[in-house]
Amino acid sequence: MAVTACQGLGFVVSLIGIAGIIAATCMDQWSTQDLYNNPVTAVFNYQGLWRSCVRESSGFTECRGYFTLLGLPAMLQAVRALMIVGIVLGAIGLLVSIFALKCIRIGSMEDSAKANMTLTSGIMFIVSGLCAIAGVSVFANMLVTNFWMSTANMYTGMGGMVQTVQTRYTFGAALFVGWVAGGLTLIGGVMMCIACRGLAPEETNYKAVSYHASGHSVAYKPGGFKASTGFGSNTKNKKIYDGGARTEDEVQSYPSKHDYV
């Protein structure tokens, strides 16, 4: 029950996180015009990863896309790449995790397969979250650097009679959305990895201690109080569950008490 809840919660948290990463990537407000100690403009500038916008005092908003690819700063390209990689990995992770959910039964999929899929999706979510956090952090660092550079240049002009208005930019809403979303995806991934441990069928709960008796060997398994001879047809490992011991065949044939919520 706890495993299913952890897995389900991990999936939901990751889903919200990835939706947030997608939203942040598409948002225009990655950087917004700093209104403090700045020349008061009749327009409000803000920029995203894909276009820059201006909102006039009337409320009229106009955006222009970055139609060049080679002319863009390398850092911006890197942030775009990190966010896209994060989205792609997250989307694949979501797809994998849907099939890995314990509450969804697909044919005769073994618990070990579900455990592997849960682990895979968990790792994907973790990497996806890290990509988003890294992307947003790189952009934030770029903003901080540019902010102080433009502050230094604000009142110096351009050397001649004509001055250029230095519009300083500060953190936009998309950065906070990205950080939170990346964090949620990361947490969701960790939860999936934790759930994977609970899903994985352990070989034995305790290490078997073998006593070599004359004629045949008997492996005494304390805790389960089950003994298995070293001969005969029953050579499969016994797995000790809360509900008693079953062979692997039995595990597949009969649903355990953990299979349904």
Partner: antibody, heavy 119, light 113 residues
Framework: EVQLVESGGGLVQPGGSLRLSCAVS????????MHWVRQAPGKGLEWVAY????????YYADSVKGRFTVSRDNAKNSLYLQMNSLRAEDTAVYYC????????????WGQGTLVTVSS | DIVMTQSPDSLAVSLGERVTMNCKSS????????????LTWYQQKPGQPPKLLIY???TRESGVPDRFSGSGSGTDFTLTISSVQAEDVAVYYC?????????FGQGTKLEIK
């Protein structure tokens, strides 16, 4: 038809006060920012003040800062300019102007009201 | 504050003639966000309030004859009247509508010879 009608102008002594009003019709007043612009007799245009549609942003020319106060009553479709500590150089025709939707332009102007500051 | 300087102060032209007047700002009026210049041109005929002619430095206001055109970017702007008509006699003002306080040029007076 967009109409802006200024009133409240007249003769006032230096140091005195005056309140100008602008009655607006023909458009949704509460959706537009408004300006006051003045023109001294025989001189050029001088921007005086701006108030945004929701009164969140208010700006003044340096020459009137601290003496003039712009306000608006969206329910009454009215714009106001409270002028205190008037000086001779404040003598001008005062225009009430709508801030345009595009380009931050000043698109509709009233006919103006004359304010004369003299002893 | 941004200083707007217009030239010439006045000019007299013949009917049908092409006329250009200039406006220079002390700071750039170009907004990188939408690649537009926040400069406006007005026409003020004697005894009348000003009338909006051009915004964004080059976009004609609706109802303005197409003989009026604006150009320029950054700090240097031009208003052109391709073929002057008698009704074009007026004072023409440029205005910075980018940075507060908004500032006007001193005006260019157009007369007919």
């Amino acid at each position: 038809e967009v109409q802006l009608v200024e009133s409240g102008g007249g003769l006032v002594q230096p140091g005195g006060s005056l309140r100008l009003s602008c009655a607006v019709s023909g458009f949704t007043f509460s959706s537009f920012g408004m300006h006051w612009v003045r023109q001294a007799p025989g001189k050029g245009l001088e921007w005086v003040a701006y108030i945004s549609s929701g009164t969140t942003n208010i700006y003044y020319a340096d020459s009137v800062k601290g003496r003039f106060t712009v306000s608006r009553d969206n329910a009454k479709n009215s714009l106001y300019l409270q002028m205190n500590s008037l000086r001779a150089e404040d003598t001008a025709v005062y225009y009430c102007v709508r801030s345009g939707y595009y380009g931050s332009s000043l698109d509709y102007w009233g006919q103006g009201t004359l304010v004369t500051v003299s002893s | 504050d941004i200083v707007m300087t217009q030239s010439p102060d006045s000019l007299a032209v013949s009917l049908g003639e092409r006329v250009t007047m200039n406006c220079k700002s002390s700071q750039s009026l170009f907004s990188s966000g939408n690649q537009r210049n926040y400069l406006t041109w007005y026409q003020q005929k004697p005894g009348q309030p000003p009338k909006l002619l051009i915004y964004w430095a080059s976009t004609r206001e609706s109802g303005v004859p197409d003989r009026f055109s604006g150009s320029g970017s950054g700090t240097d702007f031009t208003l052109t009247i391709s073929s002057v008509q008698a009704e074009d006699v007026a004072v023409y003002y440029c205005q910075n509508v980018y940075i507060y306080p908004l500032t006007f040029g001193q005006g260019t007076k157009l007369e007919i010879k």
